[in-house]
């Protein structure tokens, strides 16, 4: 039986029963987050032979081997991968061996086996027999091989049963467990699979077969499966499906994905039955099963039944996710919300065209319209009374429309109307007239010069910084004293600052009027002495971190009918000084001879600067008598030393202890300092590890269903 579209077994080990009748999992298999150690011996799924996507195991307590669960798992196709991997075994606390003794082929993708503190029998598997390329495999932080004492079947009795291959210049026996060899086919079979009796399978078989040279006896197919036969390509009038089988048009026409709407089923494109048209193609009509190329970027047309879509919350904006053309009118009415600017950008940021009008009213939560970051055309096919196609009324905190230096917006038909936007400067509106091509369409009352910008410092002067001083967690800055025409109009200054790894921030980033603001704000009172330059000490900052800072003068906004001048600075980027790093992580030590200790650690999580060297101190301690109570020649009596759970394999260091020739004399001495390239590689490695772990957590931790 084919199971799918992906099976996620979590929290309760009894959910494994879902796999009972599966021969092929069309999709992925997740087994994860089972925190209570269980007895898995009664669970066995001999029918399962193929997983078409990937297998992921994560934090399953009590599971010691996969061999009993999946004794006949032969192929993992890797049609879709988990972060480039077809097999992921991560933080499996009790796993002692992989044990998938019938696994013969991972068609696409690599493997990642990491942070499994008890996992052995890794160096005894020759992954090159299973995967095409082993260079992308990532096997790190498992039980060190020296503590495993991996022995393949028969070696203790000096009657080895397994075959040997060479890995890293080491010719050795290959096995999955203490009693299961790794299967290898005779060299006469070449790339072909073979039966248990070493007879070569049909070339279209993959992994194994029940009878030689028979394309109906394959355990899995190299290419495609159709009507009980493995075929090199799908026959006429059938289509590739999920990367492994052939289906007919009726089948493809009749299935829906978990996410799709009723009408939008699968499509047939380039001989394949797929969920959606591929990138650069679009359905040839809403009910069509066929794809045609897009002209330019593919549009997603969204239509509102009631003609006007009201955006009054994040939920209503969510309906527009991915839309590039909106057929209808947009009425934006955002009075409140949490993190509203970035949420709106997430859901409405792709809209390029609105066919009707855009009306923004009572949106007190908005500071800017930059969340409509791709809007380039308002057609105005439908207009508000008075022939308005862009209408902005009573938005108490709206300060910016768009960044007109980086924005082309055309309003094809209709006029603009602006009223009661007290923080929106008229100059900003006039700029929009020029950019959108609406200049001359508006009549006198359409842009109200009295009640737009009445509470804003509109004509801005530039404040100049005069000095900056930094320490590890402080920045002191001063700036020129600003002198408006009437000194009494200057109330105070506000300093805005935030972490800015890159010099690309803008004043309105992530800002809305409901308190969501990526900038920290500090008010600075006027110095009592008119000749003293204003300044501030920003403290509690992170060492060796770049910050963006700018300052605004807070001024009285109206002197009778005149808008008074305000002032603000450019954005200044400034880095704090370096400081003492946090402690190194994951310190490990192991002896690789009678006179040497290898010590290994990870860099501190907060380097607080550029690390230049480490200091290592050690002292002698009394010998532990416990070590003498064991027979080290007996395989099963190796004492378990508790290692830091799932960190980094000591083997990485001990394989090639460096000895250098120093000062003309031969003899061992300190290893050469790491080259920049080595340091960079290690940094990238650490970063990659972090990125993968984040990806894993983000992928598998989901809200509990209602």
């Amino acid at each position: 039986e084919i199971c799918g579209p992906g099976i996620d077994i979590r929290n309760d080990y009894q959910q494994l029963k879902r796999l009972e009748n599966c021969t092929v999992i069309e999709g992925y298999l997740h087994i994860l987050l089972i925190s209570k150690a269980e007895d898995y011996r009664s669970y066995r799924f001999p029918k399962l032979t193929v997983i078409t996507e990937y297998l992921l195991l994560f934090r399953v307590a009590g599971l010691e081997s996969l061999g009993d669960l999946f004794p006949n798992l032969t192929v993992i196709r890797g049609w879709k991968l988990f972060y480039n991997y077809a097999l992921v075994i991560f933080e499996m606390t009790n796993l002692k061996d992989i044990g998938l003794y019938n696994l013969r082929n991972i068609t696409r993708g690599a493997i990642r086996i990491e942070k499994n503190a008890d996992l052995c029998y890794l160096s005894t598997v020759d992954w090159s027999l299973i995967l095409d390329a082993v260079s992308n495999n990532y096997i790190v932080g498992n039980k060190p091989p020296k503590e495993c004492g991996d022995l393949c079947p028969g070696t203790m009795e000096e009657k080895p049963m397994c075959e040997k291959t060479t890995i890293n210049n080491e010719y050795n026996y290959r096995c999955w467990t203490t009693n299961r060899c790794q299967k290898m086919c005779p060299s006469t079979c070449g790339k072909r699979a073979c039966t248990e009796n070493n007879e070569c399978c049909h070339p279209e078989c993959l992994g194994s077969c029940s009878a030689p040279d028979n394309d109906t006896a394959c355990v899995a197919c190299r290419h495609y499966y159709y009507a009980g036969v493995c075929v090199p390509a799908c026959p006429p009038n059938t289509y590739r499906f999920e990367g492994w089988r052939c289906v007919d048009r009726d089948f493809c026409a009749n299935i829906l994905s978990a996410e799709s709407s009723d009408s939008e089923g699968f499509v047939i494109h380039d001989g394949e039955c797929m969920q959606e048209c591929p990138s650069g193609f679009i359905r040839n009509g809403s009910q069509s099963m066929y794809c045609i190329p897009c002209e330019g970027p593919c549009p997603k047309v969204c239509e509102e039944e009631k003609k006007t879509k009201t955006i009054d919350s994040v939920t209503s904006a969510q309906m527009l996710q991915g839309c590039t053309i909106f057929k209808g009118n947009l009425l934006i009415n955002i009075r409140r919300g949490n993190n509203i600017a970035s949420e709106l950008e997430n859901f409405m940021g792709l809209i390029e065209v609105v066919t009707g009008y855009v009306k923004i009213r009572h949106s007190h939560a908005l500071v800017s319209l930059s969340f409509l970051k791709n809007l380039r055309l308002i057609l105005g096919e439908e207009q508000l009374e008075g022939n308005y196609s862009f209408y902005v009324l009573d938005n108490q905190n709206l300060q910016q429309l768009w960044d007109w230096d980086h924005r082309n917006l055309t309003i094809k038909a209709g006029k603009m109307y602006f009223a009661f936007n007290p923080k929106l400067c008229v100059s900003e509106i006039y700029r929009m007239e020029e950019v959108t091509g609406t200049k001359g369409r508006q009549s006198k009352g359409d842009i109200n010069t009295r009640n737009n910008g009445e509470r804003a410092s509109c004509e801005s002067d530039v404040l100049h910084f005069t000095s900056t001083t930094t320490s590890k967690n402080r920045i002191i800055i001063t700036w020129h004293r600003y002198r408006p025409p009437d000194y009494r109009d200057l109330i105070s200054f506000t300093v805005y600052y935030k972490e800015a790894p890159f010099k690309n921030v803008t004043e309105y980033d992530g800002q809305d009027a409901c308190g969501s603001n990526s900038w920290n704000m500090v008010d600075v009172d006027l110095p009592p002495n008119k000749d003293v330059e204003p300044g501030i000490l920003l403290h509690g900052l992170k060492p060796w971190t770049q910050y963006a800072v700018y300052v605004k003068a807070v001024t009285l906004t109206m002197v009778e009918n005149d808008h008074i001048r305000g002032a603000k600075s450019e954005i200044l980027y400034i880095r704090t000084n370096a400081s003492v790093p946090s402690i190194p992580l994951d310190v490990l030590s192991a002896s690789n001879s009678s006179s040497q200790l290898i010590v290994k650690w990870n860099p501190p999580s907060l380097p607080n600067g550029n690390l230049s060297y480490y200091i290592v101190r050690w002292q002698r301690q009394p010998q532990d008598g416990y070590l003498y109570r064991h027979n080290y020649c007996s395989k099963d009596k190796i004492p378990i030393r508790k290692y830091a759970d799932g960190t980094i394999d000591i083997e990485e260091v001990t394989e090639n202890p460096k000895t250098e020739v120093c000062g003309g004399e031969k003899g061992p001495c300190c290893a050469c300092p790491k080259t920049e390239a080595e340091k960079q590689a290690e940094k990238e490695e650490a970063e990659y590890r972090k990125v993968f772990e984040n990806f894993l957590h983000n992928s598998i931790f989901v809200p509990r269903p209602e």
Epitope: I2, C246, I255, L256, D262
Partner: antibody
């Protein structure tokens, strides 16, 4: 083209059994469930159950559970429906109809029907 | 079991005129994932049934656009905008959301 060809009409005595066959062609037999629907003379349609040809898994209407057995032979792409302990009210046309076999969501149920097999139960 | 009740049971119509058939389920046939498997089948005299509408409102391929379906929850309707002579037969609604799947008792459409 896609076809479901059913066996010929049957006349049975009360208490006997009948086995109706439905031979599929023009599509992959194992990609679809086979359903059985009956229609008594002048009456409406009644779903009896279905079978998954891949593993023989069945889903019966409780009304027929004790008397019906559905089977398939994948080598000949044929489905069978056996009804035991026949009564006179089992006189009906018995239809086979296919329905997509997919773990996900399907759009519709019975897109292809057989012509029907008339089973008459009479003493 | 879910009972599907159709009305009217008989529907005489003049060609070119519209027709409407109602189908009511004894309980909601919306599945937990939001899918509603409500279908309409037409059985022409002496033939096997044929699919017209699936999932409440979607026309099956080859079905003329004069046929349309609507409804939600427990109330559903099949409409024929302009009846033609070839539309005669018995129309059945069918729910495929809950086992056992059930048909309505049928509505016989005939030409006046």
């Amino acid at each position: 083209q896609v076809q479901l060809v059913q066996s010929g009409a049957e006349v049975k005595k009360p208490g006997a059994s009948v086995k109706v066959s439905c031979k599929a062609s023009g599509y992959t037999f194992t990609d679809y469930y086979m359903n059985w629907v009956r229609q008594a003379p002048g009456q409406g349609l009644e779903w009896m159950g279905n079978i998954n040809p891949n593993n023989g898994g069945t889903n019966y209407n409780q009304k027929f559970k004790d008397r019906v057995t559905m089977t398939t032979d994948t080598s000949t792409s044929t489905a069978y429906m056996e009804l035991r302990s026949l009564r006179s009210d089992d006189t009906a046309v018995y239809y086979c109809a296919r329905w997509i076999l997919y773990y996900g969501r399907s759009k519709w149920y019975f897109d292809v029907w057989g012509r029907g097999t008339l089973v008459t139960v009479s003493s | 079991d879910i009972v599907m009740t159709q009305s009217p049971l008989s529907l005489p119509v003049t060609p070119g005129e519209p027709a409407s058939i109602s189908c009511r389920s004894s309980q909601s046939i919306v599945q937990s994932n939001g899918d509603t498997y409500l279908e309409w089948y037409l059985q022409k005299p002496g033939q096997s049934p044929q699919l017209l509408i699936y999932r409440v409102s979607n026309r099956f391929s080859g079905v003329p656009d004069r046929f349309s379906g609507s409804g939600s929850g427990t109330d559903f309707t099949l409409k024929i905008s302009r009846v033609e002579a070839e539309d005669v037969g018995v129309y059945y609604c069918f729910q495929g959301s809950h086992v056992p799947y059930t048909f309505g008792q049928g509505t016989k459409l005939e030409i006046k």
